[in-house]
Interface confidence: medium
Amino acid sequence: FKVATPYSLYVCPEGQNVTLTCRLLGPVDKGHDVTFYKTWYRSSRGEVQTCSERRPIRNLTFQDLHLHHGGHQAANTSHDLAQRHGLESASDHHGNFSITMRNLTLLDSGLYCCLVVEIRHHHSEHRVHGAMELQVQTGKDAPSNCVVYPSSSQDSENITAA
């Protein structure tokens, strides 16, 4: 399987909410011996590998924001901690998963990465990630609502195993 990032750039005004999205592509095993761990973190565009650096989102680590479930089950973070920081991650039955960030500030600007770890019990794990940029703007040049820019088809599937 791969991870697609439908949008590579989100440009939002300060104070707005935004939902960053990733999507699982390809066959997803729904058997009992497979679970998925999905999470989010901030990163920087490394020279070697984008998303290799894991930085917290609003002081919350990727462990704090993760979802852990089987196949295409739906899930969302029940962490009070995340919600207190204006964050919520969620996953649906169709392979989409997202993080919603409320009341954006300029400090939220940066590169965001989604990470999916497929754990095949008794065997191994397979990791893929996707990256997208969030730009939070203020002043007269800021849009009134979030504007999203689609990834090129090459970008959205150019995903490297972590």
């Epitope: 679970t35 761990y37 990163s43 490394g46 070697v48 590998q49 290799s52 650096e53 894991r54 930085r55 680590t61 462990q63 704090d64 852990h68 029940s78 901690l81 770890v117 754990i119 019990h121 794990e125 972590a162």
Partner: antibody, heavy 116, light 107 residues
Framework: QVQLQESGPGLVKPSETLSLTCTVS????????ISWIRQPPGKGLEWIGV???????NYNSAFMSRVTISVDTSKNQFSLKLSSVTAADTAVYYC??????????WGQGTLVTVSS | DIQMTQSPSSLSASVGDRVTITCKAS??????VAWYQQKPGKVPKLLIY???YRYSGVPSRFSGSGSGTDFTLTISSLQPEDVATYYC?????????FGQGTKLEIK
């Protein structure tokens, strides 16, 4: 084959800095997190901290003010530094590579005694 | 920090007995709990992860269950080689935390 080996002085004086190295092989340093865990003699396991892929760190607040975990990719080594040690820091220190999202592959551990 | 409270701290059982060790988390950790076995003088070895999945090579007599805050490790038929200390660990959030351990002996 994943291998980790801790090394460093077996004896450290109180108030000095404990410095340990974890030399790894069989995997890429840039792809996995490494935790340091310790076990005082006859006691339980205590997680010290982690260095994530890309070099970010997260430390147990019990050690926060005196611990540093770093990586030297050119030498395939991770290091742990713990300053201002006391006798309570006497323990077997383990480095462990994550897999399945938890510490999975452990080194053999190295005993560090803090004594004058 | 999440506290992991293990019980009992020690127990003695006979070969063939069914043995149960419990672990209680101070807050919800989902199924992000592992169990390790540590034999005297040896490195901890992973037995169970994701609360109920046996790691590769672990005998089928070991099983794990639970979610949320209450977790159990069960040895269905105790063998002499199972003498060890067993630790639960949560990896739901940092800092990773371990239970204080359960020392298992043979009667």
């Amino acid at each position: 084959q994943v291998q980790l080996q801790e090394s460093g002085p077996g004896l450290v004086k109180p108030s000095e800095t404990l410095s340990l190295t974890c030399t790894v092989s069989g995997f890429s340093l840039t792809n996995y997190d490494i935790s340091w865990i310790r076990q005082p003699p006859g006691k339980g396991l205590e997680w010290i901290g982690v260095i994530w892929t890309g070099g970010g760190t997260n430390y147990n607040s019990a050690f926060m003010s005196r611990v540093t975990i770093s990586v030297d990719t050119s030498k395939n080594q991770f290091s742990l530094k713990l300053s201002s040690v006391t006798a309570a820091d006497t323990a077997v220190y383990y480095c462990a590579r994550e897999g399945l999202l938890l510490p999975l592959y452990w080194g053999q551990g190295t005993l560090v005694t803090v004594s004058s | 920090d999440i506290q992991m409270t293990q019980s009992p701290s020690s127990l003695s059982a006979s070969v063939g007995d069914r043995v149960t060790i419990t672990c209680k988390a101070s807050q919800n950790v989902g199924t992000n709990v592992a169990w390790y076995q540590q034999k005297p003088g040896k490195v901890p070895k992973l037995l169970i992860y994701s609360a109920s999945y046996r790691y590769s090579g672990v005998p089928s007599r070991f099983s794990g269950s639970g979610s949320g805050t209450d977790f159990t490790l069960t040895i269905s038929s105790l063998q002499p080689e199972d003498v060890a200390t067993y630790y639960c660990q949560q990896y739901n959030s940092y800092p990773l935390t371990f239970g204080q351990g359960t020392k298992l002996e043979i009667k």
